[in-house]
Interface confidence: low
């Protein structure tokens, strides 16, 4: 007869490991007992369990509650056992020794491999600001057995670097993603992808990039100077900018205080019916935690009466 087993049995941490050992004997042969031992123990073989054809399953105290026979129906020639809830310390060599009648004893070895799926963690780098050079955007660390693979999935252009630390029963892999921050990266996802034979599917952790910036400021509303005449209602100036974090707006007048009746509503400066008093230099001040910008415009309110007077003078002078 001969023993049928596996060279390697692979399970994920926490799963049951079936350690196979089947005696394929000739007609009339019987299995008296099957002894299972940990074969790589430093102080010699350590018994796990013994299956006896008459007295049943005996389990070593060190494995009490963790070693069982497979569920029925059972073949009397099958000496396989289940090792419940595999832990990393279970990884190693196991020996199955079968005592048969009348053929004698047979033994076989297998290796139990316990996969430890990683629990990845993603750590964002320092605050990203437009104008910085190559900067750490995020680092991703995963520890498992065997060593996991850590990669990045993103549309953002950048560079990666990885390093690995080996521990006694596992390995930790850290991958860093560096980039040159620009405002176009704002809101873009940066995903750490961890692959491992103990995972049903890749684990993904997504970090949304936030890049601080402040665009140049400009003022809209003076495109047609002819509209800025005495008596006009609803005149307004709007300050245009964008930033991350979103900026705040402040309006001042360079050549004096804001005239009475002028309303400041965030990025908009609203005027009452225009008078020549509203002529002046107005400054929009845009700021966020990253930077500040100014834009100034000159408002020249036309007085039609003054203009017609000037025209008459010009005509009479000719």
């Amino acid at each position: 007869g001969e023993l049928e087993t596996s060279d390697v049995v692979t399970v994920v941490l926490g799963q049951d490991a079936k350690l196979p050992c089947f005696y394929r004997g000739d007609s009339g042969e019987q299995v008296g007992q099957v002894a299972w031992a940990r074969a790589d123990a430093g102080e010699g073989a350590q018994e796990l369990a013994l299956l006896h054809s008459k007295y049943g399953l005996h389990v070593s105290p060190a494995y009490e509650g963790r070693v069982e026979q497979p569920p029925p129906p059972r073949n009397p020639l099958d000496g396989s056992v289940l090792l419940r809830n595999a832990v990393q310390a279970d990884e190693g060599e196991y020996e199955c020794r079968v005592s048969t009648f009348p053929a004698g004893s047979f033994q076989a070895r297998l290796r139990l491999r316990v996969l430890v799926p990683p629990l990845p963690s993603l750590n964002p780098g320092p605050a990203l600001e437009e104008g910085q050079g190559l900067t750490l955007a995020a680092s991703c660390t995963a520890e498992g057995s065997p060593a996991p693979s850590v990669t990045w999935d993103t549309e953002v252009k950048g560079t990666t670097s990885s390093r690995s630390f080996k521990h006694s029963r596992s390995a930790a892999v850290t991958s860093e993603f560096h980039l040159v921050p620009s405002r176009s990266m704002n809101g873009q996802p940066l995903t750490c992808v961890v692959s491992h034979p103990g995972l049903l599917q890749d684990q993904r952790i997504t970090h949304i990039l936030h890049v601080s910036f402040l665009a140049e400021a400009s003022v809209r509303g003076l495109e047609d100077q002819n509209l800025w005449h005495v008596g006009r209602e609803g005149a307004m100036l709007k300050c245009l900018s964008e930033g991350q974090p979103p900026p705040s707006y402040n309006w001042t007048r360079l050549d004096g205080p804001l005239p009475s009746g002028v309303r400041v509503d965030g990025d908009t400066l609203g005027f009452p019916p225009l008078t020549t008093e509203h002529s002046g230099i107005y400054v929009c001040h845009v700021s966020n935690e990253f930077s500040s910008r100014d834009s100034q415009v000159t408002v020249d309110v036309l007085d039609p009466q003054e203009d017609s007077g000037k025209q008459v003078d010009l005509v009479s002078a000719s």
Partner: nanobody, 118 residues
Framework: EVQLVESGGGLVQAGGSLRLSCAAS????????MGWYRQAPGKQREYVAT???????NYADSVRGRFTISRDNAENTVYLQMDSLKPEDTAVYYC????????????WGRGTQVTVSS
Amino acid sequence: EVQLVESGGGLVQAGGSLRLSCAASRSTFSLNIMGWYRQAPGKQREYVATITSGGSTNYADSVRGRFTISRDNAENTVYLQMDSLKPEDTAVYYCTAELVRRGPTTYWGRGTQVTVSS
């Protein structure tokens, strides 16, 4: 074949709590991932949370910090503790389990209704 039976659903006010249970007809040790999905009326089934046999967990962003998944391998049961419930959590909640033999096989329960009133 693995049978999954959910229980614990019901009607609860916004801000309240519920605990869903899912009992498996075989040892959950061999079910290396168990978890929960949900389906609101007229919407697609969406992922809620999963737990591995080793106890590692993962959650959808929409429930992270409010829901807690746990597992009792001795009782062959997985739980979903739902706190700070919102009306948008209203859905049929389905238990799922994956068994890996030569390839992954996914099993589903019949679902339990959770209704959150405002």
